[in-house]
Amino acid sequence: MQQDGLGVGTRNGSGKGRSVHPSWPWCAPRPLRYFGRDARARRAQTAAMALLAGGLSRGLGSHPAAAGRDAVVFVWLLLSTWCTAPARAIQVTVSNPYHVVILFQPVTLPCTYQMTSTPTQPIVIWKYKSFCRDRIADAFSPASVDNQLNAQLAAGNPGYNPYVECQDSVRTVRVVATKQGNAVTLGDYYQGRRITITGNADLTFDQTAWGDSGVYYCSVVSAQDLQGNNEAYAELIVLGRTSGVAELLPGFQAGPIED
């Protein structure tokens, strides 16, 4: 088979993907409330609800239509500490339900790991994969046939995410950064960006960019701990800001936009 473009890596899709077994309960982030006065804000709220509602992580994603607007970055972290997993030799956890920042502002994707044996430092690898499908188009048409099908899929397959689960052949795959000991190495595409792996295994962007929307996989590789859930993912979404951002995201304080 031949592949064009930037999609490289394994051909069988998202690898480990969610470290949570499909039969485990889906851990839903807290819903958003609507306080808006105008229809535009209501549409934005509907889109946000689509993003954060129920079993499927259907909703928003990078889209050319968003490029002309101010932006809010949603990070929907699909693995959380409330999703408990059985003890394994290695356990990787992505912990925050979601995160909100303005475009060009910093964001951290938290990732932690636990190991049963620690003779040597493991390697932490953060990989980027573009979405299998365009989230924004689906989010802003929540009553569409597409989303009805998504809902049916969610009902029968808790934990299955059509925006994340697809072959790598149909999406872009890049290594963002790796860390062993204190040495952090950025992937080729990210050279020159102020990105680093901090703390246990957190991925930190000093400034977010439009092309950062996608799925970020935190994986931890150790020669000693070959068993267990060594990978978890987070979805990072760059969304054009609307006038309804305060209603869309209760408690969110929008700071100044930097160019």
Partner: antibody
Framework: QVQLVESGGGVVQPGRSLRLSCAAS????????MHWVRQAPGKGLEWVAV????????YYADSVKGRFTISRDNSKNTLYLQMNSLRAEDTAVYYC???????????WGQGTMVTVSS | DVVMTQSPLSLPVTPGEPASVSCKSS???????????LDWYLQKPGQSPQLLIY???NRASGVPDRFSGSGSGTDFTLKISRVEAEDVGVYYC????????FGQGTKVDIK
């Protein structure tokens, strides 16, 4: 309703080129990866090529790589298959299909016949 | 490449009776997310294929509940609980784990 309509098929001589089109309607075309699948007369189905929802990633079957090019125009809701250096064994009905959860093909066009013959 | 093998290649059926088609893959189609990347399609005479089952066991929208998919790893089965006259055609299994590969097809017709 959700629909895919192929066009551009016909009779062509070996070594020549042909471009197939697939017009999509009834769904958000720009949200989905799209595929071409073909079926030679009296034979089974053969996957040909796929393109990601934004056109940035393409993938081909070994039998067509280097000769066929898949592309899309999301502003026109249209998928394309440019077929160069056609061979007799490329004779088939060509279907476009929509990628769905699990990378299945949930919507298919009616197909367009391509005959490569001298 | 993943090779898909169907059996039988021809299946005469009696309306009202059950029928089943087998599909075997050359490697496991079970991904670590717990899902089998195996689909079933029906191509009725003179028509385009239509999706019946995806991810091993999920009925596609509008597919009658007499159709069911089962199996995991390398062995899969499509069952029709009570065959109806409209079910005739060629049934294909397809793997979507690595690239996309179809089985040879199973022709189902009325006895």
């Amino acid at each position: 309703q959700v629909q895919l309509v192929e066009s551009g098929g016909g009779v062509v001589q070996p070594g020549r080129s042909l471009r197939l089109s697939c017009a999509a309607s009834g769904f958000t075309f720009s949200s989905y990866a799209m595929h071409w699948v073909r079926q030679a007369p009296g034979k089974g189905l053969e996957w040909v090529a796929v393109i990601s929802y934004d056109g940035s990633n393409k993938y081909y079957a070994d039998s067509v790589k280097g000769r066929f090019t898949i592309s899309r125009d999301n502003s026109k809701n249209t998928l394309y298959l440019q077929m160069n250096s056609l061979r007799a064994e490329d004779t088939a009905v060509y279907y476009c299909a929509r990628d769905s959860p699990g990378n299945a093909f949930d919507i298919w066009g009616q197909g367009t016949m391509v005959t490569v013959s001298s | 490449d993943v090779v898909m093998t169907q059996s039988p290649l021809s299946l005469p059926v009696t309306p009202g009776e059950p029928a089943s088609v087998s599909c075997k893959s050359s490697q496991s189609l079970l991904r670590s997310n717990g899902y089998n990347y195996l689909d079933w399609y029906l191509q009725k005479p003179g028509q385009s294929p239509q999706l019946l089952i995806y991810l091993g066991s999920n009925r596609a929208s509008g597919v009658p509940d007499r159709f069911s998919g089962s199996g995991s790893g390398t062995d899969f089965t499509l069952k029709i609980s009570r065959v109806e006259a409209e079910d005739v055609g060629v049934y294909y299994c397809m793997q979507a784990l690595e690239s996309w590969t179809f089985g040879q097809g199973t022709k189902v017709d009325i006895k």
